[in-house]
């Protein structure tokens, strides 16, 4: 977590400022969608448990060509210790359940929103 | 319209058990934690225990754990707070109240209360 | 446990009058997540509290401007610039910080 700020960040970023701007810019996610976020892309639903960065990261990281999503990326790798590619899937996965890219940012802003509140970064 | 209405207060004995009910409406309870305080007689507030619908988070102040359990119903969109063993110092109305959906930063909304009396 | 002690226990003010609430948490409530979660709770018998003030010093949507908080680390301060005839009430002070949470033992704002 030391280095999600970046280049343009003097320092490490504390863990609470890093889960505050990934809420914040899924925030901004469901509050500029207008047409179908990803074009109504499908991915794989988590379970939202210990080790779900690495595995939200490895849903959305299918998701090519969509430009709404990409700094989520960049910014869930940086609470995911291990490299993420495309098609790599963890037990974190609901292997029979997929859902639009829309829901799958909603359901993980409501989780890590709470997460923030109960003081829990990791 | 966002709406808390509590429920199932009354007259209970000494070492009695009761449930009180608190239904949502005007939003979903997985989207944010509920609580229930009380408020004794002539006396101040109270806070005694909180849920997160979405995964049964559950937190009580310590006094109350062991004797109160809190739940809820996702289906009915509705919360519960079961009392066993009352006393008579449990008397008060109970509240529920949600916190705010956007951070979970304070208390926006609140019932009009439920009265429990503990007495033989 | 936080306690969280208000003063004065009651005041008698006329309407106009500057009212100042104080709170005193026995311990920090500064959050891990940075935020201080101390808010303003004003209640009228027979009533629900309504909130008036969120993380020290937020007016809550609604709160008429005379209403404002301030404060740090483990004292903070309810303000009435100019109390109105619907401000008497019993106002209390609440730390969502830490578990279990606390309200402070309130404070009766009484017509001299």
């Known amino acids: 977590l030391t280095c999600l700020g970046g280049f343009a960040s003097p320092g490490p970023v504390p863990p609470s400022t890093a889960l505050r701007e990934l809420i914040e810019e899924l925030v901004n996610i469901t509050q500029n969608q207008k047409a179908p976020l990803c074009n109504g892309s499908m991915v794989w639903s988590i379970n939202l448990t210990a080790g779900m960065y690495c595995a939200a990261l490895e849903s959305l990281i299918n998701v090519s060509g969509c430009s709404a999503i990409e700094k989520t990326q960049r910014m869930l790798s940086g609470f995911c210790p291990h490299k993420v590619s495309a098609g790599q899937f963890s037990s974190l996965h609901v292997r029979d359940t997929k859902i639009e890219v829309a829901q799958f940012v909603k359901d993980l802003l409501l989780h890590l929103k709470k997460l923030f509140r109960e003081g829990q970064f990791n | 319209e966002v709406q808390l209405v509590e429920s199932g207060g009354g007259l209970v004995q000494p070492g009695g058990s009761l449930r009180l009910s608190c239904a949502a409406s005007?939003?979903?309870?997985?989207?944010?934690?509920i609580h229930w305080v009380r408020q004794a007689p002539g006396k101040g507030l109270e806070w005694v225990a909180r849920i997160d619908p979405a995964n049964d988070n559950i937190k009580y102040d310590p006094k109350f754990q062991g004797r109160f359990t809190i739940s809820a119903d996702n289906a009915k969109n509705s919360l519960y707070l079961q009392m066993n063993s009352l006393r008579a110092e449990d008397t008060a109305v109970y509240y529920c109240?949600?916190?705010?959906?956007?951070?979970?930063?304070?208390?926006?909304?609140w019932g009009q209360g439920t009265l429990v009396t503990v007495s033989s | 446990d936080i306690q969280m002690t208000q003063s004065p226990s009651s005041l008698s003010a006329s309407v106009g009058d500057r009212v100042t609430i104080t709170c005193r948490s026995s311990q920090s409530i500064v959050h891990s997540n940075g935020n201080t979660y101390l808010e303003w709770y004003q209640q009228k018998p027979g009533k629900a509290p309504k909130l008036l003030i969120y993380k020290v010093s937020n007016r809550f949507s609604g709160v008429p401007s005379r209403f404002s908080g301030s404060g740090s680390g483990t004292d903070f301060t309810l303000t009435i610039s100019s109390l109105q005839p619907e401000d008497f009430a019993t106002y209390y002070c609440f730390q969502g910080s830490h578990i279990p949470y606390t309200f402070g033992g309130g404070t009766k704002v009484e017509i001299k």
């Open positions: 109240a949600r916190s705010e959906e956007n951070w979970y930063d304070f208390f926006d909304y």
């Open positions: 005007g939003f979903n309870i997985k989207d944010t934690y």
